[in-house]
Amino acid sequence: EEELQMIQPEKLLLVTVGKTATLHCTVTSLLPVGPVLWFRGVGPGRELIYNQKEGHFPRVTTVSDLTKRNNMDFSIRISSITPADVGTYYCVKFRKGSPEDVEFKSGPGTEMALGAKPSAPVVLGPAARTTPEHTVSFTCESHGFSPRDITLKWFKNGNELSDFQTNVDPTGQSVAYSIRSTARVVLDPWDVRSQVICEVAHVTLQGDPLRGTANLSEAIRVPPTLEVTQQPMRVGNQVNVTCQVRKFYPQSLQLTWSENGNVCQRETASTLTENKDGTYNWTSWFLVNISDQRDDVVLTCQVKHDGQLAVSKRLALEVTVHQKDQSSDATP
């Protein structure tokens, strides 16, 4: 007959207040005849948690049916865990005897400690928008977890980031801990649709990490490129000039036309389109009247994007004599 071994596989068991804790214990032999008991602590002051033989333990249930002869599983569940339940729990085999049962063998013990789940990570981006090729900082915070060991990772669109710094406070013993991490992210022009993810893994989460996200659309400003072009065809005595504002973000945009330095109110039409990368294109059409025989019309398309300094593009209108003739012919 194999010598009895008491197996308690977990050295440490982290539990949450109010939840049920399962303490595992298996034996390798049914001999000697006698009960298995659970204690918290060691020595004369140890506290009886469960006695297979007798007693009433309202918060304790057995995992297996101890009335089955071939049962070798003496694991127990303790319900409604409170901070008072922390300590080291021992599964102990006794040999039937008198006047008392005789302690035969003890398991190595399982330390039960209170674990607290981290709060959902909150990711905060920069206060102001930044243009591509620049670096922005994102912070991630999570609080209230225990024990102190925690893993935090940063991702940008699923790719793990390496440029970040993390602190867990306090450094000494505490009931609960907080983590704060700052990641530095280089912005790309296509990052409007990008996300940064802060992922927190903790023993209390049972392999299901918590994630916090931030959209780079909140942090990026993609400045527009401008192009002003004159349409080759004219409509009566008018020439159509187009200002194309390309690849900008966010949508906030003011466009004004100037003719020889004078701001004009007339804008024939405009369209806003969204690109696949989340940036926008804006096209504005301006009709220039060429009936008054001027040769030196300079048009300026000025764009103020997201409160930044205005950028402009100029176009010197080319009006041929033939066009002038056509226009005067067309005028009654």
Partner: antibody, heavy 118, light 107 residues
Framework: EVQLVESGGGLVQPGGSLRLSCAAS????????MHWVRQAPGKGLEWVSA???????YYTGSVKGRFTISRENAKNSLYLQMNSLRAADTAVYYC????????????WGQGTMVTVSS | DIQMTQSPSSLSASVGDRVTITCRAS??????AAWFQQKPGKAPKSLIY???SLHSGVPSKFSGSGSGTDFTLTISSLQPEDFATYYC?????????FGQGTKLEIK
């Protein structure tokens, strides 16, 4: 259903031998401590013998050296070989199963009568 | 060997009565005391183990108590089917021994 059925009892002369059998059903006999208990006519209960799960055997003083307890796992059966029988051995013999962890008797057979008389 | 002494050896009672049978061990047996019920011509039936635990299917009118050397079996409200002979037993060490029995009769 968990059941124990004894057989093999009968009338035997003093000095004779008898082998009692106990067929177990509904459980694996080798996983339990098993016992024989007897009751002489009009008398109380007397524990006779036991066999542990490890094959260890125990006897009451009056039968030591004369009785042998054994089991056959393949047949899920318990036996009591009784030699050098005496009139004082006359009794109903019960096969009894010991409890799960403390060997408390839980299941009893219906008994088989052994009469030792000339 | 450990001696188990039961008292009384016989007891008359009426239906509905509460009765107590006692058993004393010649030395401490922890709480490895069991109680059995036997009716004439039948095999004994297991009632109680480890002094106070009821076997499966045993009605709660049966209760046991005690530890060390003194043990009791109580039947809270006698019914006609409870009139039988009751035995105590120690099973802490071999040879296991029984009390001489208490015959419970209808008054």
């Amino acid at each position: 259903e968990v059941q124990l059925v004894e057989s093999g009892g009968g009338l035997v002369q003093p000095g004779g031998s008898l082998r009692l059998s106990c067929a177990a059903s509904g459980f694996t006999l080798s996983s339990y401590d098993m016992h024989w208990v007897r009751q002489a006519p009009g008398k109380g209960l007397e524990w006779v013998s036991a066999i542990g799960t490890a094959g260890d055997t125990y006897y009451t003083g009056s039968v030591k050296g004369r009785f042998t307890i054994s089991r056959e796992n393949a047949k899920n059966s318990l036996y009591l070989q009784m030699n050098s029988l005496r009139a004082a051995d006359t009794a109903v013999y019960y096969c009894v199963r010991g409890g799960v962890w403390d060997d408390a008797f839980d299941i009893w057979g219906q008994g088989t009568m052994v009469t030792v008389s000339s | 060997d450990i001696q188990m002494t039961q008292s009384p050896s016989s007891l008359s009672a009426s239906v509905g009565d509460r009765v107590t049978i006692t058993c004393r061990a010649s030395q401490g047996i922890n709480n490895y005391a069991a109680w059995f019920q036997q009716k004439p011509g039948k095999a004994p039936k297991s009632l109680i183990y480890t002094a106070s635990s009821l076997h499966s299917g045993v009605p709660s009118k049966f209760s046991g108590s005690g530890s060390g050397t003194d043990f009791t079996l109580t039947i809270s409200s006698l019914q006609p089917e409870d009139f039988a002979t009751y035995y105590c037993q120690q099973y802490v060490s071999y040879p296991y021994t029984f009390g001489q029995g208490t015959k419970l009769e209808i008054k």
